[in-house]
Every structure is written in structure tokens, then in C-alpha cells.
């Protein structure tokens, strides 16, 4: 089978500062030199793009300057970090990997990582 398998954790809990990190790993059927990684959010069967980056194997992953995502790559593994998350952003985050070059093109879609975000409690006023 020449399909591409993508693995990602089932559940991740965001930090109190609204930061969530997870690893997206893909089993490449070929030797890709150019890879595109996209994070999608699925809610009520609607899918929206959170962020995307294309990188050359061996080089760093570069998201757009205004992106809420950052990441690093190592071989067939991508370490993704999503920042600025709030409780309303809780949901399923899908890792999509595309082997862009050389031919043939391959698509790989993970099962998704459920990210739970809990807004921090506001600090009580101190009486000092």
C-alpha cells in the first residue's frame, strides 16, 4: 500500500498560558524533499485551516509571521506548537501532511488531536 500514514497523539492539554504542543509523525512512501504541513481544526464536521507551512527536508519549518503556530522538523517528525488558545478553541486538531516534491504527490491525514483548553481563573484581589 502506497498510502501515507500520519500519527499524532489522541489528547493534549494546553498549558495555563494557552499553549499546546504535539508531535505529528508521518511514514513516507517516498523520499520527499519538499513537505507541506497543515493544522486543521474540525468542529461540527466543519474543517478550517489553523496554519500551514512548507519546508525543504533538512531545513526549518517556517510559518507566516502572523501565524499562531510554530514548529520544528526532524526527519519524518514535526513538532507543532499552537499558541494563544482559549477555552472556546477546545476541539480536534488534525495534522495534514503533503509530500509536494518530487513526484508523485502523497497526502496524509492524521486522526486528530483533541486539544483541551481551560481558561485560567482570574487572580483574586489581594488585600495587602
Amino acid at each position: 500500500c502506497k498510502a501515507m500514514h500520519v500519527a499524532q497523539p489522541a489528547v493534549v492539554l494546553a498549558s495555563s498560558r494557552g499553549i499546546a504542543s504535539f508531535v505529528c509523525e508521518y511514514a513516507s512512501p517516498g523520499k520527499a524533499t519538499e513537505v507541506r504541513v497543515t493544522v486543521l481544526r474540525q468542529a461540527d464536521s466543519q474543517v478550517t485551516e489553523v496554519c500551514a507551512a512548507t519546508y525543504m527536508m533538512g531545513n526549518e519549518l517556517t510559518f507566516l509571521d502572523d501565524s499562531i503556530c510554530t514548529g520544528t522538523s526532524s526527519g519524518n517528525q514535526v513538532n507543532l506548537t499552537i499558541q494563544g488558545l482559549r477555552a472556546m478553541d477546545t476541539g480536534l486538531y488534525i495534522c495534514k501532511v503533503e509530500l509536494m516534491y518530487p513526484p508523485p504527490y502523497y497526502l496524509g491525514i492524521g486522526n486528530g488531536t483533541q486539544i483541551y483548553v481551560i481558561d485560567p481563573e482570574p487572580c483574586p484581589d489581594s488585600d495587602f
Partner: antibody, heavy 118, light 108 residues
């Protein structure tokens, strides 16, 4: 709303050229791969070509390789198919289609007819 | 290249009946990358099912998809008059992207 509208079809002689256009609206064009799919009269669907995102990566079906060129202008939200050295068996309705977030072709244009005949 | 074969070529049924359409791949296809489309005469194809079993937006629940590996099925539980059309399966996991030859569902 999300829409694709093809244009540029017509009747052309074998060996000649034609350029098809596909105008996109209602979505962030540069965030999606775009395909051309054709359908000869009375037959099934045949994938023709795809162009990804910024337009750097393109792939073609064997029957059109070396004759057809897919391109896109993200500033104009438009997809193109330049068809050279046209043959009788290129006669078909040509559809543009969007590769959705999860890969399937989720939005299709209405199609434009190309007839290659002497 | 992954070759897709569909059967039967034509399915003659009456409204209200159940339709079962088959799609077979020449090599294993991940279920994540198998789609079904509906096409009516003079119209563009319409995405029905993606990922082998997920219904596209706005598709009625009488349409369902199943299968894995090399064998996939589209089921229409109770045919409505508007369901008589041609149905195509497609793999989109790798290039070249390929379609099956189609199954025509017509009125008996």
C-alpha cells in the same frame, strides 16, 4: 458563496491551442490546490492536472503531459489551463475543481466544452 | 497508478429501494482518501462522501459509505427520484488521482 466559473472553451482545429480559465470566489484561493478534470462525451471523469498553493508544484496525467500547462494567478483568484497541440481525443467538458481541506474535490465549476475538430 | 473498477455498470431500481454500489481498487487505498461523487446529466459532479464514510456538507443521511483496503461501498438506503444519476468513486491519496468508470443508477 464559494464558486468556480470556467470559461475559454470552444471549437478548435487539431494541432491548435486554447486557454481555459477558472475564476474562483468566496474562499482564500491561495490556500487550496486546484484541479482540472475532463469528461469526453458519453464517458467518465478523467483527472487532467493539479497545481498546489503558491503554484510551484504541478502534476499532470500522462495523456496531457508535455502538451498542457496548468497555472494560477493568486492575485486574480484565477486558475488556467493552456492546451497546446490539441487532438481529437481532447474533446471534452473541462471542469475545474478545488481540493478541499481533507483532499477530496469539494467544489466544482459548471464546466466548459472544448471541441477539437477539423 | 491505482486503477478503480466499479460494479455494476448499471443498476436498475425503483424509488424507495436500496442501492448498493461497489468500487474496487487495484491496490490498497487508505480509507482516508476514497471519495464518491454524484453526477446528473448536464451537471458537474457533486461530492457525496469523503474519507470512505464521511458525508459532505448538505448530503442527506440516506447516503452512506463504507469499506477499506481494496473494497469500498456506497449505499443509498431508500432511493429518491433525484438520486437517479451516475456515481463515481475516486482515490485522492496520491498522484495520479484516479476515478472509477462510474455506475449508472436508473429507474426500473
Amino acid at each position: 458563496q464559494v464558486q468556480l466559473v470556467e470559461s475559454g472553451g470552444g471549437v478548435v482545429q487539431p494541432g491548435r491551442s486554447l486557454r481555459l480559465s477558472c475564476a474562483a470566489s468566496g474562499f482564500t484561493f491561495s490556500s487550496y490546490g486546484m484541479h482540472w478534470v475532463r469528461q469526453a462525451p458519453g464517458t467518465g471523469l478523467e483527472w487532467v492536472a493539479v497545481i498546489w498553493y503558491e503554484g510551484r508544484n504541478k502534476y499532470y496525467a500522462d495523456p496531457v503531459k508535455g502538451r498542457f500547462t496548468i497555472s494560477r494567478d493568486n492575485s486574480k483568484n484565477t486558475l488556467y489551463l493552456q492546451m497546446n497541440s490539441l487532438r481529437d481525443d481532447d474533446t471534452a467538458v473541462y471542469y475545474c475543481a478545488r481540493a478541499g481541506d481533507l483532499g477530496a474535490f469539494d467544489i466544482w465549476g459548471q464546466g466548459t466544452m472544448v471541441t477539437v475538430s477539423s | 497508478e491505482i486503477v478503480l473498477t466499479q460494479s455494476p455498470g448499471t443498476l436498475s431500481l425503483s424509488p424507495g429501494e436500496r442501492a448498493t454500489l461497489s468500487c474496487r481498487a487495484s491496490q490498497s487505498v487508505s480509507s482516508s482518501y476514497l471519495a464518491w461523487y454524484q453526477q446528473k446529466p448536464g451537471q458537474a459532479p457533486r461530492l457525496l462522501i469523503y474519507g470512505a464514510s464521511s458525508r459532505a456538507t448538505g448530503i442527506p443521511d440516506r447516503f452512506s459509505g463504507s469499506g477499506s483496503g481494496t473494497d469500498f461501498t456506497l449505499t443509498i438506503s431508500r432511493l429518491e427520484p433525484e438520486d437517479f444519476a451516475v456515481y463515481y468513486c475516486q482515490q485522492y491519496g496520491s498522484s495520479p488521482f484516479t476515478f472509477g468508470p462510474g455506475t449508472k443508477v436508473d429507474i426500473k
